[in-house]
Interface confidence: low
């Protein structure tokens, strides 16, 4: 008799996750000396630990600490970039500007970009067919949980002047409800952090309106600004010519705005 | 030219032992990891154990941990995999495969060996 399987929402866990998770973490301890110390196989165990046997609604901060305490890592705080619905530039620019880091750019973030997971009650299964959609289902499932920890620990990490990258081509270029607005705004140190620095990315060759303007962007400072932090805001009209001047700034193009 | 040549397959009983090699050439051995995949007869590829480049770092799926035992020899640019209480499920192509080149997803992306045949049965 093929035994009864909750059918959630969601896409189920990414197909090979468990070789993905000890691969990715190979890959980065072999090329992060700083983390050469870390025991991927553990690192794996305690993954697996948070969400395997138990509800997938019913995942919580706590399942997670364990992963947390193994993948603890210091980044430079005054260094940290945090982007919102623009993660692929996000990237290419810290790949460039290696001496900045966005959350995947650390070993728990890296371990789990672009991955689904979760497991089923009562069995030690991971479910490949199916997995909670954070509105359709339940917010308390495993992925979205594990983003909001360590998003969480991420800025509370936080120091000096904080940049956040946004994209000036959505209708709201902050989002109260993404993770940087429910969560990463709210958990900056006011007593570690003295400036969000928020860069607004332009998606039309023509924009050259100033998004910073934006009552998005107002909603933001406000919030910002009642948590006794700086707010200060840059557009990025070309990020194509903003990434070129990143990787050659010496270019006699790179002084005019960007 | 990369090379990966795995040897040592066979037909063994249940609960028997086989230890499998693999010669690798063509690329600075030590410098990467290495892993075992297997294809059991119309399945896919299963990842089973890798090692780290230095060889400190051993990892096991959970269907063969505390009965395999993967180790490497860079100094004869070797890898191993040492095969205890072999059960019938274990009955598969083993091929040895390079970290070289990974995207970070997976094992067996880069370079494979043309694989060896382990057999268990009574």
């Known amino acids: 008799v093929p035994r009864w399987r909750q059918q959630w929402s969601g896409p189920g866990t990414t197909k090979r996750f468990p070789e993905t998770v000890l691969a990715r973490c190979v890959k980065y301890t072999e090329i992060h000396p700083e983390m050469r110390h870390v025991d991927c196989q553990s690192v794996w165990d305690a993954f697996k630990g948070a969400f395997i046997s138990k509800h997938p609604c019913n995942i919580t901060e706590e399942d997670y600490q364990p992963l947390m305490k193994l993948g603890t890592q210091t980044v430079p705080c005054n260094k940290i970039l945090l982007w919102s619905r623009i993660k692929d530039l996000a990237h290419q620019f810290t790949q460039v500007q290696r001496d900045m880091f966005t959350l995947e750019d650390t070993l728990l973030g890296y371990l789990a970009d672009d991955l689904t997971w979760c497991g089923e009650f009562n069995t030690s299964k991971i479910n490949y067919q199916s997995c909670p959609d954070w509105r359709k289902d339940c917010s308390n499932n495993p992925v979205s949980v594990f983003w909001k920890t360590v998003s969480r620990r991420f800025a509370e990490a936080a120091c000096d002047v904080v940049h956040v990258m946004l994209n000036g081509s959505r209708s709201k270029i902050f989002d109260k409800n993404s993770t940087f607005g429910s969560v990463e705004v709210h958990n900056l140190q006011p007593e570690k952090v003295q400036t969000l620095e928020a860069w607004v990315i332009h998606g039309g060759r023509e924009d050259s309106r100033d998004l910073c303007q934006d009552p998005t962007i107002k909603e933001l400072e406000s919030i910002i600004s009642k948590r006794n932090i700086q707010f200060s805001c840059k557009n990025i009209y070309r990020p194509d010519k903003f990434l070129q001047c990143v990787k050659n700034p010496e270019d006699s193009s790179c002084t005019s705005e960007i | 030219e990369v090379q990966l040549l795995e040897s040592g397959g066979g037909l063994v009983q249940p609960g028997g032992s086989l230890r499998l090699s693999c010669a690798a050439s063509g690329f600075t051995f030590s410098s990467y990891a290495m892993s075992w995949v297997r294809q059991a007869p119309g399945e896919g590829l299963e990842w089973v154990s890798a090692?780290?480049?230095?060889?400190?770092?051993?990892y096991y799926a959970d269907s063969v941990k505390g009965r395999f035992t993967i180790s490497r020899d860079n100094s004869k640019n070797t890898l191993y995999l040492q095969m205890n209480s072999l059960r019938a499920e274990d009955t598969a192509v083993y091929y040895c495969?390079?970290?070289?080149?990974?995207?970070?997803?997976?094992?067996?992306?880069?370079?494979r060996g043309q694989g060896t045949l382990v057999t268990v049965s009574s």
């Open positions: 495969a390079s970290g070289k080149g990974w995207d970070g997803n997976t094992w067996y992306e880069d370079y």
């Open positions: 090692i780290s480049g230095s060889g400190v770092n051993t």
